[in-house]
Each structure stands twice: as C-alpha cells, then as structure tokens.
Interface confidence: low
C-alpha cells in the first residue's frame, strides 16, 4: 500500500528561522498537499510535478520547494509564532494517504526551553499548546492580508 514518509517528526525553531519538511512516497500519486492541522485544518501548499505550485496566501513568499512530488522538500521561511502547529503531508492517490506529521514549534528566541521535541511522532490530539499569544490563526482572518502585486503573485 502507498505510504507517506514524513520528516522530521518535530522541530523547535526561533522566530524568523526556516524549517524543512520532507514528504516521500513510493510514487504513483497525482500531487501532494501540506496541511496544517488544528480545529480547522488549513491547506498550506499543493505541489504537482509539471504544474506551478500553489501556496496559501498566509505563506506566499515564504515557501520554497525542492525535489519532485515523490520526494518533496518544503522549506518554510521567516517563521512566525502563529505558524506553530502540526503539518502533515497528504498524497493524492486513488486513496488519499497522510504522513505522520511534523510538529513545528516556533518560539521567541529567549524562550527556546519552553517546548522541546521528543522522539515520538506528533499526534494532533496531544499537541502542546503554543506560547500565549501565538495560537493558530483563525481561518476567518488568516488570509485577510493584502496579497503581493499580481505580477509577483503565485497562481
């Protein structure tokens, strides 16, 4: 059966830093999503070989891709406290398949010790709460910021 290998399981990074998430499959998929889990899951990117990747407006200008849809590395730049959360890869196949998830903990530089990653894969039902004031954005407002000019906006 098709599986999605996802790494890392967890990473703690300071505000402004970058993180790599890798989604690997055995092939035979149509495309791959990266989804941020939470009370209201949000699709972050969609990647399909031969097609311009699409990125949620909250992350536009902060996402890079390398590799192919079978072995895709997604780099999220200039991380903000509100980016804290679990991100899971979803492979679009005849039956959609999910990765184990990556818990991204974005912390203030002086508070690196607040949350540390364990070796266990993250579970959406057992996530540590993000630091006060950095809860995941309300989906009703997360995309309400102006977008870059049309000439530079991704499709």
């Amino acid at each position: 059966a098709q599986e999605v290998q996802q790494s890392p399981h967890c990473t703690t990074v300071p505000v402004g830093a970058s993180v790599n998430i890798t989604c690997s499959t055995s092939g035979g998929l149509r495309g791959i999503y990266l989804r941020q889990l939470g009370p209201q899951p949000q699709d972050i990117i969609y990647y399909e070989d031969g097609v311009v990747p699409t990125t949620d407006r909250r992350f536009r200008g902060r996402i890079d891709f390398s590799g192919s849809q079978d072995n895709l590395t997604i780099t999220m730049h200039r991380l903000q406290l509100s980016d804290t959360g679990t991100y899971t890869c979803q492979a679009i196949t005849e039956v959609n398949v999910y990765g184990s998830g990556t818990l991204v903990l974005v912390t203030e530089e002086q508070s690196q010790g607040w949350h540390r990653c364990s070796d266990a894969p993250p579970r959406a039902s057992a996530l540590p709460a993000p630091p006060t004031g950095s809860a995941l954005p309300d989906p009703q407002t997360a995309s309400a910021l102006p977008d870059p000019p049309a000439a530079s906006a991704l499709p």
């Epitope: 149509r30 495309g31 999503y33 989804r35 899951p41 949000q42 699709d43 990117i45 969609y46 399909e48 097609v51 311009v52 990747p53 699409t54 990125t55 949620d56 979803q90 679009i92 959609n96 989906p139 009703q140 407002t141 995309s143 309400a144 102006p146 977008d147 870059p148 000019p149 049309a150 906006a153 499709p155």
Partner: antibody, heavy 123, light 110 residues
C-alpha cells in the same frame, strides 16, 4: 472534456433541507478547489461556498454560514452542498464551478461551470 | 446590495472598444489582486473571462483584457462582436474569507 452536472434541486418548504450534488469529470477532481455560486431569478451572481481540493479548507458567504455545509468525495468525483434551515431568499439556480488552477481556492468562482440546478423555497 | 458597483449598462458598435468598470473599496478591489470577470448569456451558465485582475483562461480571446487602478477594476472588450452582447459580472476577494460580486453590466452591441 471538463463536465460538471448539478442535481438535487427542487421545491422545499421554508425551514427544510436539500442536498445538492455536482458530478465532475474530465479533470483530476482532487487537485482543484470547487465552488458553489447561486443566482436568484432575474438577479445577479452570489458566491455561496468553496472548498479546497483535499477538502481541508472550506469557505462560506456570511448569508449561509451555519446553515450550509460544503463537502466533497474525491473518490466519487462529487461535490456536495448540504442546505439546512432554508429561507425564501435562498431560492436560486445553484451552480457548481471548478477553480482554474490546481491546489487552492484562489477567490475566483471558476473557469468551468455546470448548467445549474434550481432550488425553490416556498410554502 | 452588491459589494461591488458596476454600471447597469454599456454599449458599443461592432469593432469598437468598450470598458466596464467595477468599483469597490480598499477592503476588496483595492486591497487584493483577486478580481475576476464573468460573461453570461441569457439562460446560460457564466463563463470566466478574466481572473486575478488580468489573467485570461485558455480559450478566452485576447480581445478581453483586465486591469485595476486603486479601488476600481476594469474589463475592456476591444473589436466588439455581436456575440459579446451579454451580462458581465465582476468579483473580488473582500477580506474575511468572502467573495463579493458586482451587480452586473448588460453590454449591448449596437
């Protein structure tokens, strides 16, 4: 060839429910966001709801929030709109439409539309 | 009441150009590059003509072009043809996960 075929419309009393379906073919359904747009008789277009390709993100117009639910079954290439607590002002032709680019709903109603299904809310 | 304001009618002779405006605010048209234009013939489903201000879907002739200045978006139809006679609607992202439409403009080819 891209085809979208809506069904499920009809006459319903105020306060009632209906479930609209939109059968899609001719494209990789799971890769595209989908929308519902309605048009009251003799009136203009009104966006109702949208859903991303995986179904992970949903969006609703204020006028239907809490009453309508959009969903999709990518294994059946079908889009749905569950409409509850219907009101007379919900009377319209309901169109489903496909986003022009794969991935996210990028705030465009769609490049391919079905022919619509009429919903009439009346006692 | 429509979120976006369009003139109720516009007209032009075959071969001429006509421009239809779509006026909003800094919270919709002026704040985002998610303006689309749709053509609808009587009794038919709408057809997307322009999206993201100026992008044309495949199959839409380059006689149709979109632009935006401040809080007003415009659709220009050049080299008017009889089949261009239809209703035209604009839409724009309006913030807070809402998509607003204009009231529509009836284009008449004289």
């Amino acid at each position: 060839e891209v085809q979208l075929v809506e069904s499920g419309g009809g006459l319903v009393q105020p306060g009632g429910s209906l479930r609209l379906s939109c059968a899609a073919s001719g494209f990789t359904f799971s890769s595209y966001a989908m929308s519902w747009v309605r048009q009251a008789p003799g009136k203009g277009l009104e966006w109702v709801s949208a859903i991303s390709g995986s179904g992970g993100s949903t969006y609703y117009a204020d006028s239907v929030k809490g009453r309508f639910t959009i969903s999709r079954d990518n294994s059946k290439n079908t889009l749905y709109l569950q409409m509850n607590s219907l009101r007379a002002e919900d009377t319209a032709v309901y169109y489903c439409a496909k986003d022009p680019d794969p991935g996210y709903f990028d705030w465009v109603a769609g490049d391919y539309w079905g022919q619509g299904t009429l919903v009439t809310v009346s006692s | 009441q429509s979120a976006l304001t369009q003139p109720p009618s516009a007209s032009g002779s075959p071969g001429q150009s006509v421009t239809i405006s779509c006026t909003g605010t800094s919270s919709d048209v002026g704040g985002y590059n998610y303006v689309s234009w749709y053509q609808q013939h009587p009794g038919k489903a709408p057809k997307l003509m322009i999206y993201e201000v100026r992008k044309r879907p495949s199959g839409v002739p380059d006689r149709f072009s979109g632009s935006k200045s401040g809080n007003t978006a415009s659709l220009t139809v050049s080299g008017l043809q009889a089949d261009d006679e239809a209703d035209y609607y604009c839409s724009s992202y309006a913030g807070s996960n809402n998509l607003g439409f204009g009231g529509g403009t009836k284009l008449t080819v004289l």
